[in-house]
């Protein structure tokens, strides 16, 4: 769920998600439209696709709570719980490390980006 994702992103990137990523660009945070603005924004667009796939599979992406371990900079998704919980953790782990990989191109100007400026074709999943 959202609490899992926030905690994981903070642990992996060292940034407070509420201040740094939700929202950011055209796809980080709730919703998403248009062409991603940079690599960080692409991480979020890919994550949206991951969630969309789980939604089509009947998973409660915002409610399901999963267990994971954070140790020595790595995330280990617990193999306990339901199929949805395990898949949700995998989606969140991927976006957390994607955001970390792209910290060097993070642009402060894209925080709280005005969504009406998000134009162009929204990438498909």
């Amino acid at each position: 769920g959202i609490l899992n994702l926030n905690k994981m992103v903070k642990q992996v990137t060292g940034k407070m998600p509420i201040l740094s990523y939700w929202p950011y660009g055209c796809h980080c945070g709730l919703g998403g439209r248009g062409q991603p603005k940079d690599a960080t924004d692409w991480c979020c667009q890919t994550h949206d696709c991951c969630y969309d796939h789980l939604k089509t599979q009947g998973c409660s992406i915002y409610k399901d709570y999963y267990r994971y371990n954070f140790s020595q900079g790595n995330i280990h998704c617990s193999d306990k719980g339901s199929w949805c919980e395990q898949q949700l953790c995998a989606c969140d782990k991927e976006v957390a490390f994607c955001l970390k990989r792209n910290l060097d191109t993070y642009q402060k100007r894209l925080r709280f980006y005005w969504r009406p400026h998000c134009r162009g074709q929204t990438p498909g999943c």
């Epitope: 089509t56 599979q57 009947g58 998973c59 409660s60 399901d64 267990r67 617990s78 193999d79 306990k80 719980g81 339901s82 199929w83 949805c84 919980e85």
Partner: antibody
Framework: QVTLKESGPGILQSSQTLSLTCSLS??????????VSWIRQPSGKGLEWLAH???????RYNPSLKSRLTISKDTSRNQVFLKITSVDTADTATYYC????????????WGQGATLTVSS | QIVLTQSPAIMSASPGEKVTISCSAS?????MYWYQQKPGSSPKPWIF???NLASGVPARFSGSGSGTSYSLTISSMEAEDAATYYC?????????FGSGTKLEIK
């Protein structure tokens, strides 16, 4: 050879507490990924999952019964326990323990069941 | 929680007849699992991950489906197949079972 064997009181009065034991052999509950569930079946009816305990003592409960259930284990004796408080006639059923490995999403080995009758 | 509805509740089939048991989920699931239970015995895993037969299950059994609709099929009914069959999901928590289909031999 993997086996699970349930034991319990057989008969209880309404409002008493049910204590069940599942004795395991052929595998160790301390092995990473192992877990045991309790599942019950009223006579002639379907199956209802109650609770699950993992190798690391993490526990899960059926939300509809959570307030009445306690699952626990004794790794040294390779046993799993279930307590159900304030039983009534609706709890009359056969109680099974079953193994689930975390990477799988089904129960691969089941005990033969322990029958409970609750009298009012 | 996900509710699994099995149909029919009871059915009878003649030896050699094709049998199909259905399991409908209240919301989409990734896989379905099936158990066979005979009177006085505990359930036995029968089909896992929708279509994979458990060890020792005869090849006349098969499983299929996706989303909210799954089925177990016996290509040619035999006397030893008379039993109650349950579907089960652990797609989302808590794991749930269908109400069962009692299959009798004519």
């Amino acid at each position: 050879q993997v086996t699970l064997k349930e034991s319990g009181p057989g008969i209880l009065q309404s409002s008493q507490t049910l204590s069940l034991t599942c004795s395991l052999s052929g595998f160790s509950l301390s092995t990473s990924g192992m877990g045991v569930s309790w599942i019950r079946q009223p006579s002639g009816k379907g199956l209802e999952w109650l609770a699950h305990i993992y190798w690391d003592d993490d526990k899960r409960y059926n939300p509809s019964l959570k307030s009445r259930l306690t699952i626990s284990k004794d790794t040294s004796r390779n046993q799993v326990f279930l307590k159900i408080t304030s039983v009534d006639t609706a709890d009359t059923a056969t109680y099974y323990c079953a193994r689930r490995e975390s990477r799988y999403f089904y129960f691969d080995y089941w005990g033969q069941g322990a029958t409970l009758t609750v009298s009012s | 929680q996900i509710v699994l509805t099995q149909s029919p509740a009871i059915m009878s089939a003649s030896p050699g007849e094709k049998v199909t048991i259905s399991c409908s989920a209240s919301s989409s699931v990734s896989y379905m699992y099936w158990y066979q239970q005979k009177p006085g015995s505990s359930p036995k895993p029968w089909i896992f991950r929708t279509s994979n037969l458990a060890s020792g299950v005869p090849a006349r059994f098969s499983g299929s489906g996706s989303g909210t609709s799954y089925s177990l099929t016996i290509s040619s009914m035999e006397a030893e197949d008379a039993a109650t069959y349950y579907c089960q999901q652990y797609h989302s928590y808590p794991p749930t079972f269908g109400s069962g289909t009692k299959l009798e031999i004519k």
